[in-house]
Amino acid sequence: IIPVEEENPDFWNRQAAEALGAAKKLQPAQTAAKNLIIFLGDGMGVSTVTAARILKGQKKDKLGPETFLAMDRFPYVALSKTYSVDKHVPDSGATATAYLCGVKGNFQTIGLSAAARFNQCNTTRGNEVISVMNRAKKAGKSVGVVTTTRVQHASPAGAYAHTVNRNWYSDADVPASARQEGCQDIATQLISNMDIDVILGGGRKYMFPMGTPDPEYPDDYSQGGTRLDGKNLVQEWLAKHQGARYVWNRTELLQASLDPSVTHLMGLFEPGDMKYEIHRDSTLDPSLMEMTEAALLLLSRNPRGFFLFVEGGRIDHGHHESRAYRALTETIMFDDAIERAGQLTSEEDTLSLVTADHSHVFSFGGYPLRGSSIFGLAPGKARDRKAYTVLLYGNGPGYVLKDGARPDVTESESGSPEYRQQSAVPLDGETHAGEDVAVFARGPQAHLVHGVQEQTFIAHVMAFAACLEPYTACDLAPRAGTTD
Amino acid sequence: IIPVEEENPDFWNRQAAEALGAAKKLQPAQTAAKNLIIFLGDGMGVSTVTAARILKGQKKDKLGPETFLAMDRFPYVALSKTYSVDKHVPDSGATATAYLCGVKGNFQTIGLSAAARFNQCNTTRGNEVISVMNRAKKAGKSVGVVTTTRVQHASPAGAYAHTVNRNWYSDADVPASARQEGCQDIATQLISNMDIDVILGGGRKYMFPMGTPDPEYPDDYSQGGTRLDGKNLVQEWLAKHQGARYVWNRTELLQASLDPSVTHLMGLFEPGDMKYEIHRDSTLDPSLMEMTEAALLLLSRNPRGFFLFVEGGRIDHGHHESRAYRALTETIMFDDAIERAGQLTSEEDTLSLVTADHSHVFSFGGYPLRGSSIFGLAPGKARDRKAYTVLLYGNGPGYVLKDGARPDVTESESGSPEYRQQSAVPLDGETHAGEDVAVFARGPQAHLVHGVQEQTFIAHVMAFAACLEPYTACDLAPRAGTTD
């Protein structure tokens, strides 16, 4: 498919001249950021970004790659080096420590320097590192965490928790010996480490005692509370703040977000991770875009500004399943949340960053025709005279041998939301990838986001832009219209 | 392996504070660029950059990812959308048209708008688009092309040629019907379309008549001249310029580059593509770094400045073979050339860009320990109880079934320069990938390289920075010390 207008050199020359004009007009703002938003696409490597752009464009009846994601419109880009101190290819815990606390840690640890060792409780104390969210709170800002995973998951936990094991969601997940040594589960830390104004995502079951039925799935014992200590953490959290509200469904969320008496909001919409966007019950569960909007409505009331973490956390899960359909539709919803946030905030006073914690071994090749489905087949056949998809994985559960050979695939099979793209190596879960990821930046001090940087740089840019510790002497003019 | 100093948060905080300090000091130069250099890593997607960084670092006895490539030091980064007008995943011809001419074309065409059709000679005329190199020459600058492939290959050809078929290297490759219609082979266009001051790379056989023995392989008929028209294009080129010199080996190149009487230099060091760096005969063939240095010595004599295209063209070939060792060692030599060029030029007057034309379906996963070989095995076993490598391909010739199953692999096998990493789909040649690639920029107007851009933007930035057509009214101050 060749669009007629693109056959004319003028089309490209005009477009590039406009882009140059926009580039020339870019003026680094010398003001501080009142608000900080970090959008974290978990597992959203560059290949995921491009594939999602095409899919989002095609959903709007375009050919695809010529269209723009919301994040594509951010004026500044850097590359982020994601390795952890102990691994070339990291996990979401060590990376969260990097981009939220500004310090690299070890694989599967959270909020701790690399002096801490995975699963060794006694290496926790003294090695805690403090997140930018925590520092923002101390500076009088409102703070929030929004995610499509459990709110106790590795990425959001980087904003508030310190743990040698990212899997210690509730006390039931913490070995008795570690509990005795004083190591707290992540859910406990969520409500006790710091005052978080908005908490939205999944993870109900980790907040309630074992035997507590889940409100959405009351007959399903496996979805009920998991806690062994008998604590109702939601109740404890509500008791801390007079204007606190707990919600567990979309209707309640929308009501609470418009209620001026609500000062603190916790919304937990699933027992564990939230459902994939394509499986979401839109009457019961809010979308990531809706959660982001609700968070912004509450947080933006604070004249001192806010810090908000927004995670598209299940992009990663789709990839781990080798189900690109899930990963890419999650990426589109993530991008929709970015777009909505952009409409609700001003780049005059809000530094917005979009990045990934790491990538995935996910590729998009095979020379497909422009406008063809991102989930489709490559032109021609493979060496084994069978079709193959343009999307593939290096490793993962999509590896199958049928009668000692690679299975054939049709366009209708590969387009299914359940289809697992093939991989070179059979694994239960496809792995992360270690290549640099993009950082997109907009707003005050966004121009500092440049070149190739360590992932830790992200936290430092946020702290500096908002004159938070250790950059309180930031020497930046307050943003225009500050009310503080 | 956990470096002790990295266990201390101060290590990361200090490092980030330094990076922030450097970012704050970045001042966009308001001057024009006297010189333009574009370094093109063919097939050098972000996964290749990261893997090469680790390998280069480990060759210096470091753990790897914490080190810097020369390109990593460039202060500005953008992402480039590489699709061609007709394909989501492009080839090196259409992409060369984009980044060298500023207009997107169709798959496998070069220097033509998308109104031209692959292999249809009669769609050539009237659809030619003019490269930045050509415009630089018209503005009085010296110009050069350096590559590790044939100089008639798709990427370098984008600087000087217009062809509906990238494979028309010599007239022997052009169908008689197309020759009759007036379509010229790329080698002919190399010497006749424009005056190129420096031409260095492979591609001897396309310049000489059939039956002409190759000077390096005189007994090997397959390496000799291929031309059917009886023309000796080297002789014709030499006749055009009084100070022209033709060389075919390293010794002659080094002599010529230091000879002030040489104004034009053509060095063709292999009949076809140059050898991979790891196979290069260091007495006969120059490295990419040496060719780059030679080109800069000649070109920098011009007080009006120069345009130089430098291609690490065989990164791509290594990937097509699914031999990551070759791809990554080529990338390191490419980076070495960038480093050397940086030493020989000044960022006060030279805009240097580093980019890729496209990526490859190449991934780096599996959670390997820091410091472990990039060519090594992932920890643990796959589902089939066999080892697997951290580097893998989505498709390509590394797919093998042994007795109806995926072959096992040892660390020593995977570390071999000849090892082909496994892939999900068996193809004769691994394919390009369609995700965005990085653009690294340094020098005057480098700050314009920002955000997510069409690949065409690259050509326009170069043209604008040097006030070339269509940006002669660029309104930029001449660089300091201009002698024009």
Partner: antibody, heavy 123, light 106 residues
């Protein structure tokens, strides 16, 4: 002109060792892969060992049949490749050839061979 | 390791005959196959590499073809001086020879 000359062959008793040498000339020795092959009486050609070039760290590879007994090495200052053969067996009796690889079409083609040296393992 | 199965092991043909020798690899060898002529008491001589590229000085009656796992050496018109043993060699992954084909004149 590329030349490869093998030496060091001869009669040796089973269980003993022998070192073969391959003296190279006419090319930049450090840039090339060197290999050893053999042909036993009445048998086919067999690859034994390979040593790579400077650019690839002079890494080595062996066929399963000789791994652990034979060692390939090189003295780059003298442009000599060696094959150290230990624990020799009667079935190691063969003509041993030294070869240099040339990279054509990016494959390691065995374009250059020495004339061979005879090794006889017998008691 | 890649195995090479060469056939036939011996072949008797008349001068002027078209002779074909085949080699099958245990896996795809990406056209990295060479053919050697071996005469007793001499070093093996490279005749063809990369499936079909003739070495300098090799008569044009010799040709090679194939792809994937299957490869062929053809002598279009057998000459007396062609009497020798021919070996295929894969060099995609290290080196492996075929068992050889002894060519004789009837």
């Amino acid at each position: 002109e590329v030349q490869l000359v093998e030496s060091g062959g001869g009669l040796v008793q089973p269980g003993r060792s022998l070192r073969l040498s391959c003296t190279a000339s006419g090319f930049t020795f450090t840039d090339y892969y060197m290999s050893w092959f053999r042909q036993a009486p009445g048998k086919g050609l067999e690859w034994l060992a390979l040593i790579r070039n400077k650019a690839t760290g002079y890494t080595t590879e062996y066929s399963a049949s000789v791994k652990g007994r034979f060692t390939i090495s090189r003295d780059n200052s003298k442009s000599i490749a060696y094959l150290q053969m230990n624990s020799l067996k009667t079935e190691d009796t063969a003509v041993y050839y030294c070869t240099r690889a040339s990279f054509y079409y990016d494959g390691k083609v065995l374009a250059y061979w020495g004339q061979g040296t005879l090794v006889t393992v017998s008691s | 390791d890649t195995q090479m199965t060469q056939s036939p092991s011996s072949l008797s043909a008349s001068v002027g005959d078209r002779v074909t020798i085949t080699c099958k690899a245990s896996q795809d060898i990406n056209k990295y196959i060479a053919w050697f002529q071996y005469k007793t008491g001499k070093a093996p001589k490279l005749f063809i590499h990369y499936t079909s590229t003739l070495q300098p000085g090799v008569p044009s009656r010799f040709s090679g073809s194939g792809s994937g796992r299957d490869y062929t050496l053809t002598i279009s018109s057998l000459q007396p001086e062609d009497i020798a043993t021919y070996y295929c060699l894969q060099y995609d992954n290290l080196y492996t020879f075929g068992q050889g084909t002894k060519l004789e004149i009837k």
